[in-house]
């Protein structure tokens, strides 16, 4: 049985970014038909993970897993698909809590982003890592880069691959 | 608001193992009162992640996220806590699909474990990585080590931190 998962292409792109492997990221970006400016924006985010070393990739993976398996996400999925549940199926759309976290990572202040992460994982090392990544992204990315990253995310969320 | 998540201490231990950072693993193991033999067993698993390099940590994180956010896990959580849902709460117990995967990782054959992973993430690079990790664990761990790892997992699943 092949399980339906919540927006698999989103997690593929997220892990390609966090992994630091540019070849895998290039492939994921091709799969979602990313434009040149969108590619540039995502690679700037990847640079932050690479510069911050292995620990940032693993800790951010932990945050993503924690949010994705949180009451928030499960509750959302449940409430959005009560009818589906009776048929034992579940919607594949991305969990709003994950979406919110990604939006804050790009458009929020460092404090807002860290506060959102803290709702799910309050370990000091996790929060410190979240702040370092957020500061790096704010330093590297122009407003235009952030808009391009958001437009790519919209493309991902509405993609048939999601 | 601090969100309830499905067995947070399990994910702490999993990511500490997969991260390859022994200091984080020591901390997680202390939290669940791991015995010396249980510590030894978990460190043998961690050695496999370290030896297999960064890619195994990221890919296994992807598998864990995918399973944790799969229809299987969400469905289980929902069906197990229908009453709770009416009160807008969700049980924190670990998802049975995650439990199954971990059990097979320790006690199943490589084929059984890879087949379980393939239900959630069929990318060849993911499955190859899963097989390498499983073979490494089978080579490194004695039957006694595996029993100790399983006893620690029981401790985690029944812990108030779960």
């Amino acid at each position: 049985v092949k399980m339906a998962e919540t927006c698999p292409i989103f997690y593929d792109v997220f892990f390609a970014v966090a992994n630091g492997n540019e070849l895998l990221l290039d492939l994921s970006l091709t799969k979602v038909n990313a434009t040149e400016p969108e590619r540039t924006a995502m690679k700037k985010i990847q640079d932050c993970y690479v510069e911050n070393g292995l620990i940032s990739r693993v800790l951010d993976g932990l945050v993503m897993t924690t949010i994705s398996s949180s009451k928030d996400c499960m509750g959302e999925a449940v409430q959005n698909t009560v009818e589906d549940l009776k048929l034992n199926t579940l919607g594949r759309e991305i969990c709003p809590a994950v979406k919110r976290g990604v939006d804050l990572f790009l458009t929020g202040t460092p404090d807002e982003y860290v506060e959102q992460v803290a709702q799910y994982k309050a370990l000091p090392v996790v929060l410190e890592n979240a702040r370092i990544l957020k500061n790096c992204v704010d330093a590297k990315m122009t407003e235009e880069d952030k808009e391009n990253a958001l437009s790519l995310l919209d493309k991902i969320y509405t993609s048939p691959l999601c | 608001v601090k969100m309830a998540e499905t067995c947070p201490i399990f994910y702490d231990v999993f990511f500490a193992v997969a991260n390859g950072n022994e200091l984080l693993l020591d901390l997680s193991l202390t939290k669940v009162n791991a015995t010396e033999p249980e510590r030894t067993a978990m460190k043998k698993i961690q050695d496999c992640y370290v030896e297999n390099g960064l890619i195994s940590r990221v890919l296994d994180g992807l598998v864990m996220t995918t399973i944790s956010s799969s229809k299987d896990c969400m469905g289980e959580a929902v069906q197990n806590t229908v009453e709770d849902l009416k009160l807008n709460t969700l049980g924190r117990e670990i998802c049975p699909a995650v439990k199954r995967g971990v059990d097979l990782f320790l006690t199943g054959t490589p084929d059984e474990y890879v087949e379980q992973v393939a239900q959630y993430k069929a990318l060849p690079v993911v499955l190859e990585n899963a097989r390498i990790l499983k073979n490494c664990v089978d080579a490194k761990m004695t039957e006694e080590d595996k029993e100790n790892a399983l006893s620690l997992l029981d401790k985690i699943y029944t812990s108030p931190l779960c």
Epitope: K2, E22, L27, E36, P160, L161 | V125
Partner: antibody, heavy 115, light 107 residues
Framework: EVQLVESGGGLVQPGGSLRLSCAAS????????MHWVRQAPGKGLEWVSS????????DHADSVKGRFTISRDNSKNTLYLQMNSLRAEDTAVYYC????????WGQGTLVTVSS | DIQMTQSPSSLSASVGDRITITCRAS??????LAWFQQKPGKAPKSLIY???SLQSGVPSKFSGSGSGTDFTLTISSLQPEDFATYYC?????????FGPGTKVDIK
């Protein structure tokens, strides 16, 4: 208009080396992964190597691992394939291509490995 | 590695015919499949990506369908310039792999 032009092919003895080049134009070269694909005479297509947009990561087919190295110079918009320890079975037309679904191809350059 | 198979390996058809070529992947590749046309002595030409999206400039007589493991390329009305070899390729994951090709010649 996207253009890819390969060069550097020729006749080489078994065990010898050759460096292929692919000059790219018409797109932002550093934004895209680039690839080498080959075709032995009368045979099908075989992926050989890929390199990420900024050259941080690469991958090679098992048949060429340890012998071939892909690289790129983004300042020159050029892709390279360094081929060492060549064997008769490496005889093929070598194409460079852009994007993972090989949207654009060069015209190819023939590499013949023979004594 | 993902194996790609194509059928038939060759087919003879007449101008105006509608033909279908099948490509099968050894495991689920979602819709990450491309189709190419190659004429003797020439580089391959990209026809379709994403299983069904037509490359710009490719005539609409070409169409692709499928998802998961089974895919088809259809040419609705064969023209003299369409006699060539057709290849499928998966780009779901490295290493990228091609089908062995289907040669379409004049009956």
């Amino acid at each position: 208009e996207v253009q890819l032009v390969e060069s550097g092919g020729g006749l080489v003895q078994p065990g010898g080396s050759l460096r292929l080049s692919c000059a790219a134009s018409g797109f932002t070269f550093s934004t895209y992964a680039m690839h080498w694909v080959r075709q032995a005479p009368g045979k099908g297509l075989e992926w050989v190597s890929s390199i990420s947009g900024r050259g941080r990561n690469s991958d090679h087919a098992d048949s060429v691992k340890g012998r071939f190295t892909i690289s790129r110079d983004n300042s020159k918009n050029t892709l390279y394939l360094q081929m060492n320890s060549l064997r008769a079975e490496d005889t093929a037309v070598y194409y460079c291509a852009r994007t993972e679904y090989f949207h654009h191809w060069g015209q190819g350059t023939l590499v013949t490995v023979s004594s | 590695d993902i194996q790609m198979t194509q059928s038939p390996s060759s087919l003879s058809a007449s101008v105006g015919d509608r033909i279908t070529i099948t490509c099968r992947a050894s495991q689920d590749i979602n819709n990450y499949l491309a189709w190419f046309q190659q004429k003797p002595g020439k580089a391959p030409k990209s026809l379709i990506y994403g299983a069904s999206s037509l490359q710009s400039g490719v005539p609409s007589k070409f169409s692709g369908s499928g998802s998961g493991t089974d895919f088809t390329l259809t040419i609705s009305s064969l023209q003299p310039e369409d006699f060539a070899t057709y290849y499928c390729q998966q780009y779901s994951s490295y290493p990228f792999t091609f089908g062995p090709g289907t040669k379409v010649d004049i009956k």
